[in-house]
């Protein structure tokens, strides 16, 4: 048995930050689980990890330098990514693993979410400012 995952096909990070919600066909509340977000078609970069155990506080971390936070819902984990760079525009995949109680479970690979990072466009000061008003 595999858990099914739903993600938005595309998200735009206008202010270098984005909320990516991973929706699962599975209730995580009474489970020890590891939810992770992976970057790239080959999922080579583990962007963020949310580790949950029903009796303890959620642990959220990134070992790859991403600024991330995570929030647990009944059947979802939302990853909040901040300080994204334009060159981090890519496809991102949600992964879920249920560690306990046994048996171990994971998900069917999802379709992923393309995160398009649009950098902050600071308005440049005009080269020839017009006459100042009195």
């Amino acid at each position: 048995n595999k858990i099914l995952v739903k993600q938005s096909p595309m998200l735009v990070a206008y202010d270098n930050a984005v909320n990516l919600s991973c929706k699962y066909s599975y209730n995580l509340f009474s489970r020890e689980f590891r939810a992770s977000l992976h970057k790239g078609l080959d999922s080579a970069v583990e962007v963020c990890v949310v580790y949950g155990n029903y009796s303890q506080q959620l642990q959220v971390y990134s070992k790859t330098g991403f600024n991330c936070d995570g929030k647990l819902g009944n059947e979802s984990v939302t990853f909040y990514l901040q300080n994204l760079y334009v060159n981090q525009t890519d496809i991102y995949f949600c992964k879920i693993e249920v560690m306990y109680p046994p048996p171990y479970l994971d998900n069917e690979k999802s379709n992923g979410t393309i995160i398009h990072v649009k950098g902050k466009h600071l308005c440049p000061s005009p080269l020839f400012p017009g006459p100042s008003k009195p």
Partner: antibody, heavy 120, light 107 residues
Framework: VQLQQSGAELVKPGASVRLSCKAS????????IHWIKLRSGQGLEWIGW????????QYNAKFKGKATLTADKSSSTVYMELTGLTSEDSAVYFC??????????????WGQGTLVTVSA | DIQMTQSPASLSVSVGETVTITCRTN??????LAWYQQKQGKSPQLLIY???HLVEGVPSRFSGSGSGTQYSLKITSLQSEDFGNYYC?????????FGGGTKLEIK
């Protein structure tokens, strides 16, 4: 899915007994088996569970030292040994299979129960 | 450990009536609760899982409700075959405690 339990046992105080629960109709190593006690005139009491896939075990603290859960994968059988028997251990013991309903647990399949009578 | 308080301990009702059995826990179990029926000399039978989901083949006169720490099993239009013992059980960690049981008798 079937859980076939061993027959009734009449045992003396202080003795031990081993009950069996033979599973069929599914992949034995993929499901947790729970054990439950039912004393006459009382309610159901959870003893513990055994996972044959990795030999993981969880006991109710009340039954630690009283019950020992093991399994034989070749015969798809889970065993529960009860030691140091007293009249308090006289009861019907059930095994039941835990199913995972998308993250919610329940026990949909039960054995027929084994009656253990402790008497001198 | 989670404490399960089931009430009432016994009920004497007539065929056709409606009954409600409740189960209270000392902490939130997030709907990780099952209800069972057990008849004399038989194995328990699962009726409801995840607090509200009816098991396939169980008559629709049985229904489960509740969340957090308070859960109920309702049986409408009681039939003669509904008499017996009823138990709730939580699955929020271990031990997976049962409620004390409710004995449903014919009046």
């Amino acid at each position: 899915v079937q859980l076939q339990q061993s027959g009734a046992e009449l045992v003396k105080p202080g003795a031990s007994v081993r009950l069996s629960c033979k599973a069929s109709g599914y992949t034995f190593t993929e499901y947790i088996i729970h054990w439950i006690k039912l004393r006459s005139g009382q309610g159901l009491e959870w003893i513990g569970w055994f996972y044959p896939g990795s030999n993981d075990i969880q006991y109710n603290a009340k039954f630690k030292g009283k019950a020992t859960l093991t399994a034989d994968k070749s015969s798809s059988t889970v065993y529960m040994e009860l030691t140091g028997l007293t009249s308090e251990d006289s009861a019907v013991y059930f095994c039941a299979r835990r199913d995972d309903f998308s993250g919610y647990d329940a026990l949909p399949y039960w054995g027929q129960g084994t009656l253990v009578t402790v008497s001198a | 450990d989670i404490q399960m308080t089931q009430s009432p301990a016994s009920l004497s009702v007539s065929v056709g009536e409606t009954v409600t059995i409740t189960c209270r826990t000392n902490e939130n179990i997030y709907s990780n609760l099952a209800w069972y029926q057990q008849k004399q000399g038989k194995s328990p039978q699962l009726l409801i899982y995840a607090a509200t989901h009816l098991v396939e083949g169980v008559p629709s006169r049985f229904s489960g409700s509740g969340s957090g720490t308070q859960y109920s099993l309702k049986i409408t239009s009681l039939q003669s075959e509904d008499f017996g013992n009823y138990y709730c059980q939580h699955f929020w960690g271990t031990p997976c405690t049962f409620g004390g049981g409710t004995k449903l008798e014919i009046k």
